[in-house]
């Protein structure tokens, strides 16, 4: 849950892509003003992942939930929100 | 803002070699079939995409990034 | 020794559909390490790249944004060859046109004899 | 596209001397993942298909004769016959494969004096 709030469009287009749901990849890319060019090469990501089947996807999502959920960016995400904390109480 | 480490799989995924990529998934999960199935999914990308097709798929990574979205 | 043999008809008239085959040997269409490409040449444009299609696990094509909205560039694995159709041909498409072999998507490194092709009016 | 440009638009040589043709890309066709320059060389003679010499900028394809060779990077790149011999009379051409759409040079024509 932490790690799609520090960008929930990246993780949105990465779960689209292993997903293998075209429709949803191209409402995803349509969020960034995807262009032609570009739909078409993460069409083709999304291909490597339909075709190495269902195992493939969970194994992909396995290690994106890991690293995202890794000291080094939980660590970067608490700094962030250490950071935030001060900004807004300067703020005040 | 997306994470440091995120991004460097990401561009590792892209631009980097079977090795490199295998390399950086196994300092977060070092399981053989976790590995095997990186390689293949980095062995697929690049016989798929073309130079310019990595490109194109870093320009949408960027779009991503600079995303108020993100 | 891979070779590439072209057929089709050297005269077209315009608004017509241009389509010329590719018979390989000494590989595989749908081979995955390689893409067949036509290209073609004439004297006001040289030589022109107008689009390739390649085999990995599905089949993709790339085309020149000059001819997209009427080529086309179709394999037929039964037949190991490939073929270029084009559509609505006005004069200006009178030129030879090759078809090529590019390992991976790069370096042409076989080529077929050629075929001139004259779009009459 | 990347737009090629050659030069000389032709040659004449003495059998013996040296040939060297140019070429300039509009953008660079190094590619700063794997360092490789993706262009290739070909030569064209009168009622053949183009036939390949060098790729990757500088690599000869079997059976080129290694009078023949290339070199450049970036935009800027040659090749070079370093004893012009009678068959080497042809149109030559450079081409960039880093973009999905692949883009030749106009050619040179190199002749005999």
């Known amino acids: 849950v932490k790690m799609a709030e520090t960008c929930p469009i990246f993780y949105d287009v990465f779960f689209a892509v292993a997903n293998g749901n075209e429709l949803l990849l191209d409402l995803s890319l349509t969020k960034v003003n995807a262009t032609e060019p570009e739909r078409t090469a993460m069409k083709k990501i999304q291909d490597c992942y339909v075709e190495n089947g269902l195992i493939s996807r969970v194994l992909d999502g396995l290690v994106m939930t890991t690293i995202s959920s890794s000291k080094d960016c939980m660590g970067e995400a608490v700094q962030n929100t250490v950071e935030d904390l001060k900004l807004n109480t300067l703020g005040r | 803002e997306i994470c440091p480490a995120v991004k460097r799989d990401v561009d590792l995924f892209l631009t980097g070699t079977p090795d490199e990529y295998v390399e950086q998934v196994a300092q977060y999960k070092a399981l053989p079939v976790v590995l095997e199935n990186a390689r293949i999914l980095k062995n697929c990308v690049d016989a798929k995409m073309t130079e310019e097709d990595k490109e194109n798929a870093l320009s949408v990574l960027d779009k991503i990034y600079t995303s108020p979205l993100c | 020794q891979v070779q590439l043999q072209q057929s089709g008809p050297g005269l077209v008239k315009s608004s017509q559909t241009l389509s010329l085959t590719c018979a390989i040997s000494g590989d595989s269409v749908s081979s995955n390490s390689v893409a067949w490409n036509w290209i073609r040449q004439s004297p006001s444009r040289g030589l022109e790249w107008l689009g390739r299609?390649?085999?990995?696990?599905?089949?993709?094509?790339d085309y020149a944004v000059s001819v997209k909205s009427r080529i086309n560039i179709n394999p037929d694995t039964s037949k190991n060859h490939f073929s270029l159709q084009l559509n609505s041909v006005t004069p200006e498409d009178t030129a030879v046109y090759f078809c090529?072999?590019?390992?991976?998507?790069?370096?042409?490194?076989?080529w077929g004899q050629g075929t001139l092709v004259t779009v009459s009016s | 596209d990347i737009v090629m440009t050659q030069s000389p638009d032709s040659l004449a040589m003495s059998l013996g001397e040296r040939a060297t043709i140019n070429c300039k890309s509009s953008?660079?066709?190094?590619?700063?993942?794997?360092?490789?320059?993706?262009l290739g060389w070909y030569q064209q003679k009168p009622g053949q298909p183009p036939k390949l010499l060098i790729y990757?900028?500088?690599t000869r394809e079997s059976g080129v004769p290694d009078r023949i060779s290339g070199s450049g990077s970036g935009t800027d790149f040659t090749l070079t016959i370093s004893s012009l011999q009678a068959e080497d009379v042809a149109v030559y051409y450079c081409?960039?494969?880093?973009?999905?759409?692949?883009?030749f040079g106009g050619g040179t024509k190199v002749e005999i004096k």
């Open positions: 090529a072999r590019a390992w991976n998507w790069y370096y042409l490194d076989y």
């Open positions: 953008q660079s066709v190094l590619y700063s993942s794997n360092n490789k320059n993706y």
């Open positions: 081409q960039q494969y880093l973009r999905n759409t692949l883009t």
């Open positions: 990757w900028a500088s």
């Open positions: 299609t390649y085999y990995r696990s599905k089949w993709y094509n």
